[in-house]
Every structure is written in C-alpha cells, then in structure tokens.
C-alpha cells in the first residue's frame, strides 16, 4: 500500500498559525477570517542523513499545492523557502533529498524542525505577525520553534 | 450535545487550596483541537480568564495569577480541574468552566458550565 | 482593570438599535485575533453571541450583529427587545500574555 503523507493544521503558543501569501509562508493570528495551510508530512524512506537523537526525517510540503519546504544559503545565511515540488515526488526517490529534509523531534507535546542540511537551524516563527516563516539557531524567547500540529481531516 | 459541570466545595477558608473540577459530558475531553478554560466573576463584577487546558495537555495561565494556579486534566473520568493556593476574599466568586475549538469557535469559548460560587471566609 | 475596554452601561428603548464597544490593543484585536461577544443575562452563565467577529451561532436572532476595525470591535443590537437586558461582554486572545482576555462588560438597559 502506498505510503501517503499526514496532514496537520500548525500552531504556536502565541496561536498564531501559518499562511501561504504568494509563494510565501507568514505566520498569522488563528481567526475565521484567514485560511491556515495544511502541512504535509511524510519520512524520508532513505536513512542517509539519519540522526535518531535529532528526530525522524521528513519531508514539509503544502496540502492542495504542489509546494514543499527546503532550505537554501542566500547571502551566507541558510534560508528557509517553498519550492515548487511534489511531496510525494520527493519520498519515491530513492535518494533523500537533503535541502528539503528536517528532523522532526517532539519536545513535550510541541514538534521542532531542524534543517538536515543545516543542522542547529529550526524552522521558527517571530513574536510579530504577519512575518515570513523562516530559520534560526537562536531558540528561545524572540523566536518560537516549538509548534502545535493539530490533526485536521 | 457537549455540556459541563463543574463542581466543589462552596466554602474554602483563607490561605487554603481551592479545587474545582469541571464534567464533561456529550463529548470527550481527548477530542481533537479542544480546548478547556476556567473563568470566573467575583460577584458583581466583570469575567476574568484564569487559564486554560488544551487536547495536547498544553496549558496557559493569566499571568497574574499564574504562580497559584494548576489546571489538570483526568481523561479516565473525562473531567478537568482547577487548583488555586493561598486563597484570599478576593478569590471569592462565581467559576465557570467553558470550551472550545481552535479551528471552529478560534479563540472563544462557546460551552460553558453553569458556574459554581466559591466563598473564601473563615 | 480589563485589557479590553468597554462602556460599563448603555440604554435604549424597545425598538431602538444600540452599539457596545471593545476597545484593545495591537497585541490582541489590533493583531488581527478575532472579538467574541457573550450575553450574561441575570443569574446565568455567558452564553456565546458572537464569534470570530461577526458570525452568530445557530438560534442567535439576526438583530444581533458584531464587527470589528482595527484595535476596536463593536455588538450592534436593532429592535431592542425587554428580554435583551442582561451584561455584555466582548473576548479576544493577547498574545503577549498568550491568554485569553475579556472586556469589563457592559449593562444594557431596556427602557421603559
């Protein structure tokens, strides 16, 4: 049976959700007014770049898109952006594709994700709304890593 | 249809421990995207939100009063209680427990207990 | 004193249409997190009104209205009705406190 990815609604502590504006991830006050993406998840069947300590690696890509989650170095600094990809054109490879694996950890009953090609970066979201989704090694106050996924049908 | 009740001692004597617990019925407390809270309204006054429990076990309290809380969840008898030390006058009022959906009622609470007065007196 | 803030009465004759207004922040309505509003009516728990701005819950008669611009939400209510008296309160989500915040409420009197 094919394998086939989950899909979660995302959220912080601060309930602020993600949102896709253009080709763009923000983070935005959960309301009725704005539509949450729903994230796609699925593991990277190739155990190349496996680390147990730091989670099991996955695959972040947008339900009803073909959109996926990687990461990049632009000015010297490791980004994190959507590229136009199929989630599941990247788990049949047989080979991981490393910009646009993360290791999912649970800490608690939150999810951190850590860049596989740029370890100690997490996905975060800021403190201020309607700012872009992006990558930091500052965990901590300013910056949220840790998130809510919510099952959603 | 989802209904709550709380339920507890009417009298608690200054510096003691209040504890509240909160029955749901008509659903389960486990249930996706839920969240649990326990307001209260000291009488003749306003609401005031004292903190909250979601299906994660998540929870988040009002900053000012957030070193004498604790809010637990028993999903064995799919109840959630309330904990409040070192009561005072001021602590005396109408509880009430409420509910509701992170992605349904965003943020609101749109079940509520019928309240349960909570007299702190010697 | 409540985060958001709303006038502590307001009166009206049956038949008239009055306003109640919530005041916040850019850390809660001004951050674009939704206003719920809540009817208190003697002796009896808050029920819900209106939630995520403007939208009623099923049984909520259409003369009930809510909207919201900027830091600041209001409850319309047209057609006052003797059975509309009771407290009002609007409810919204501050993220600097990552809680729940409500406002003072508000009493409505129906005249006469």
């Known amino acids: 049976r094919e394998a086939a990815p989950k899909s979660y609604a995302i959220r912080d502590s601060r309930q602020m959700v993600w949102v896709l504006s253009g080709n763009s991830l923000i983070a935005a006050p959960l309301s009725r007014s704005i539509k949450p993406v729903t994230l796609h998840l699925i593991a990277c069947r190739d155990t190349e770049f496996s680390d147990k300590e730091k989670g099991n690696m996955v695959y972040l890509g947008i339900k009803g898109k073909d959109l996926c989650l990687f990461c990049a170095e632009i000015q010297g600094k490791p980004t994190l952006q959507l590229k136009e990809k199929n989630i599941m054109d990247l788990y049949v490879e047989k080979k991981a594709q490393k910009p646009f694996l993360f290791f999912h950890n649970k800490e608690g009953s939150t999810s951190v994700f850590q860049s596989v090609s740029y370890p100690g970066w997490f996905i975060a979201t800021s403190t201020t709304s309607g700012q872009p989704i992006f990558l930091t090694k500052e965990r901590g106050i300013t910056n949220n890593t840790n998130f809510y996924l919510d099952s959603v049908e | 249809e989802l209904q709550l009740q709380e339920s507890g001692p009417g009298l608690v004597k200054p510096s003691e421990t209040l504890s509240l617990t909160c029955t749901v019925s008509?659903?389960?407390?486990?249930?996706?995207?839920?969240?649990w809270g326990w307001i209260r309204q000291p009488p003749g006054k306003g609401l005031e939100w004292i903190g909250s429990?979601?299906?994660?076990?998540?929870?988040y309290y009002n900053p000012s009063l957030k070193s004498r809380v604790t809010i637990s969840v028993d999903t064995s008898k799919n109840q959630f209680s309330l904990k409040l030390s070192s009561v005072t006058a001021a602590d005396t009022a109408v509880y009430y427990c409420?509910?509701?959906?992170?992605?349904?009622?965003?943020?609101?609470?749109?079940?509520w207990g019928q309240g349960t007065l909570v007299t702190v007196s010697s | 004193e409540s985060v958001l803030t709303q006038p502590p009465s307001v009166s009206g004759a049956p038949g008239q249409r009055v306003t109640i207004s919530c005041t916040g922040s850019?850390?809660?309505?001004?951050?674009?997190?939704?206003v719920h509003w809540y009817q208190q009516l003697p002796g009896t728990a808050p029920k819900l009104l209106i939630y995520?701005?403007?939208n009623r819950p099923s049984g909520v008669p259409d003369r009930f209205s809510g909207s919201k611009s900027g830091t600041s939400a209001s409850l319309a209510i047209t057609g006052l009705q003797a059975e509309d008296e009771a407290d009002y309160y609007c409810?919204?989500?501050?993220?600097?406190?990552?809680?729940?915040?409500f406002g003072g409420g508000t009493k409505l009197t129906v005249l006469g």
């Open positions: 409420a509910t509701g959906k992170y992605y349904e009622t965003y943020l609101g609470f749109d079940v």
């Open positions: 008509g659903g389960s407390i486990t249930a996706s995207n839920t969240y």
């Open positions: 429990i979601d299906y994660t076990g998540s929870t």
């Open positions: 850019s850390s809660n309505i001004g951050a674009h997190y939704d």
């Open positions: 995520g701005n403007d």
């Open positions: 409810q919204s989500y501050d993220y600097s406190l990552s809680g729940y915040v």
